[in-house]
Structures are given as C-alpha cells and as structure tokens.
Interface confidence: low
C-alpha cells in the first residue's frame, strides 16, 4: 500500500492523543534504554510503511501484535485517513482472526514495540528529512 496520500496530520493527532500512551502501557515495566533502535524511516509515508509492517506482520519470536490496543487504534487510523487502505487489509484481517491471542509478552515483542515507538516518533516530527 502506498501511504503517500494519507492525512498525516490526522494520523499524528491520533498518535498523540491515544496510540502513544497505548504503546507506553504495553512497554510498562521495561526500561526505556533496554533496546537499541534498529529500524528507521526517512519520511512520513516510509514511516507508515514500516509501522504497518512491524505492527501487523508476524515476526520470529513475536507472532502477533495485531490484537493489542495500540495496533487496533493504528489500524483504525490508517483505515480512516489513508484512502483505500481498508480494502488492502481484508485478507490480512482474515488471517489475523485465525491466530491465537498472545498470552505472554515476549522480550521480542517488547523489542518490536520499542522499534515502533521510534518509528512513530520519527513520523510525528514535522520536519522529517526528504519530506
């Protein structure tokens, strides 16, 4: 999906008002310096591409974040403010329903959400490079 035509300011507002705090809630009890940043992004569409990938794509050691509160709100924000995004996610949603809900927060998931926090911060900056 091409995130170029999203309403970035509306997505930023959604992040500031709620998604940011949901990410922090998920990370509660984890020291802010425990993980090194390994994922970056250069402009807002790129940031959203990376955010979507880390939030909704299963990775080794972290099967699914998609049912977490921050993920559901991220999905809603993208669906509302990125034209055509919902249509591209129908297959992904069906697959997501088949996964079991994560019972424990693995260290890999914490690391992944830490990366998400960094990506969101870069997205949130108004003067991103190459934008």
């Amino acid at each position: 999906y091409d995130f170029t035509n999203c309403d970035f300011e509306k997505i930023k507002a959604a992040y500031l008002s709620t998604i940011s705090k949901d990410l922090i809630t998920y990370m509660s009890g984890t020291k802010s310096t425990e993980f090194n940043n390994t994922v970056s992004c250069s402009n807002r569409p790129h940031c959203l591409t990376e955010i979507q990938s880390l939030t909704f794509n299963p990775t080794a050691g972290c099967a699914s974040l998609a049912k977490e509160m921050f993920a559901m709100k991220t999905k809603a924000a993208l669906a509302i403010w990125c034209p055509g995004y919902s249509e591209t996610q129908i297959n992904a949603t069906q697959a997501m329903k088949k996964r079991r809900k994560r019972k424990v927060t693995t260290n890999k998931c914490l690391e992944q959400v830490s990366q998400l926090q960094g990506l969101w911060r870069r997205f949130n900056r108004p003067l991103l490079k190459q934008q």
Epitope: K12, S17, S20, I24, Q117, G118, R121, N124
Partner: antibody, heavy 122, light 108 residues
C-alpha cells in the same frame, strides 16, 4: 559513568557573544537528542533549544530564536550553544541535558550537566 | 504557546503524602515528566511519561495524568524530599519543551 560537563560560561557585556560547550561521556551520545535548558537566578527552568540525535533538526525557544545556535559533533561527543547578541535577561545557569528520543514518546531529560553560569552585564 | 500552571508552594508534614499539581489545557493527551531540584544542584528526573519512574527513584514517587491536570504524588514524605519540583511536556504544536513554573515543597 555517564556524565555531561558544561563549560564556557562567564561574564559578558550586552550585545557580545559567548559559546558554551557540553562534553558527554559514558553513553552513546549520537543516539540521544540533546537540549539546553537555563535557569535565571531565583527563577524556574526555561527550555532553550534542542538538536536531534543525528543533528538533522533544531528547535529554539522564541526568546532566543535568531540569536542562539545549537550544534553537535557526534565524533567528539560534544554539544555547543553559540549565543550572539546577548541580553541582560539571558543571565542564567545553562544546563545541557539528554533526552532518549527513540524510546520516550516525548522528551524527558534523564541526564543533566552541573550547569555553567552566564552573566550578561555592562 | 502552551502553558503549564503549578502552585508556587506545597507544605506537608513528614510521613504524610504530598500532591503537586500541574495544570494545562487537555494535558491528559500529553506525556508529562517531573523533576526534582535541590538548591545549587541540577534537576533530577523523578517521573517520566506520566507515571513511570527511573530505576534510582524511590517507589514513594508516583504520577498520574488525565483531563486538565497532572499530579506528582510523594508518599511518606521525608525531609530529604524538600526541593523545587517542575512538570514538563513537549508541545507538539510548536515543537517546544514547556516547563511549569515550579513548586517549592516544604517539609514541616
């Protein structure tokens, strides 16, 4: 251990310039956003400026915009504040502070220097 | 620009609970950080992201944030807690850091 050490303070006449430096050690300087915060005698904390971890962006308080310039040299682990056209109201203790911008959703200063005094007086 | 309002002073007896407030328009939608500053010393972060505490800070320090008010709570206050306390946010609309005016905590 992790520390920030400011230098360059002193007494200067109004309209003149001064350059403050902050030497960082004990941590990965290049991964942190860096700020200057000042405190006038008997007053509260006032934020002055920020520079991102990679130096790509800077922001300034309205009271210093156009007069102060924040820079960093990640190869030398140093932060600088060039202060031009100084005024009496710039008299304060100047602190450098780091903010782990990749991890907190909004800047929080988890390490401060001891401060350096700048006095602007004729 | 965004404004944070703190009471100039708060007094509390040793062993009691001190509550220092920080008011701002819809501050609950922002992340609030709190600093302790003792005379002649640099500030020290005591609470960040509304309610998280750096590892070296005692559990007696806690924070909350909702609506138009953030609160720093210090339980079982000790004489050593006497200091100035500042709240702080990042104002995303201006890309400025904003500090409250500070609150002097006096332990009676």
């Amino acid at each position: 251990q992790m520390q920030l050490v400011e230098s360059g303070g002193g007494v200067v006449q109004p309209g003149r310039s001064l350059r403050l430096s902050c030497a960082a050690s004990g941590f990965a300087f290049r991964t942190y956003g860096m700020h200057w915060v000042r405190q006038a005698p008997g007053k509260g904390l006032e934020w002055v400026a920020v520079i991102w971890d990679d130096g790509s962006n800077t922001h300034y308080a309205d009271s210093v915009k156009g007069r102060f310039t924040i820079t960093r040299d990640n190869s030398k682990n140093t932060l600088n504040l060039q202060m031009n056209s100084l005024r009496a109201e710039d008299t304060a203790v100047y602190y450098c502070a780091r903010a782990p911008q990749w991890y907190l959703s909004a800047e929080a200063f988890d390490l401060w220097g001891q401060g350096t005094m700048v006095t602007v007086s004729s | 620009s965004y404004v944070l309002t703190q009471p100039p002073s708060v007094s509390v007896a040793p062993g009691q609970t001190a509550r220092i407030t920080c008011g701002g328009n819809l501050i609950g939608s922002k992340l609030v950080h709190w600093y302790q500053q003792k005379p002649g010393q640099a500030p020290v972060l005591v609470v960040y992201d509304d309610s998280d505490r750096p590892s070296r800070i005692p559990e007696r320090f806690s924070g909350s944030n909702s609506g138009n008010t953030a609160t720093l709570t210090i339980s079982r206050v000790e004489a050593g807690d006497e200091a100035d306390y500042y709240c702080q946010v990042w104002d995303h609309s201006s890309d400025h850091v904003v500090f409250g005016g500070g609150t002097k905590l006096t332990v009676l």
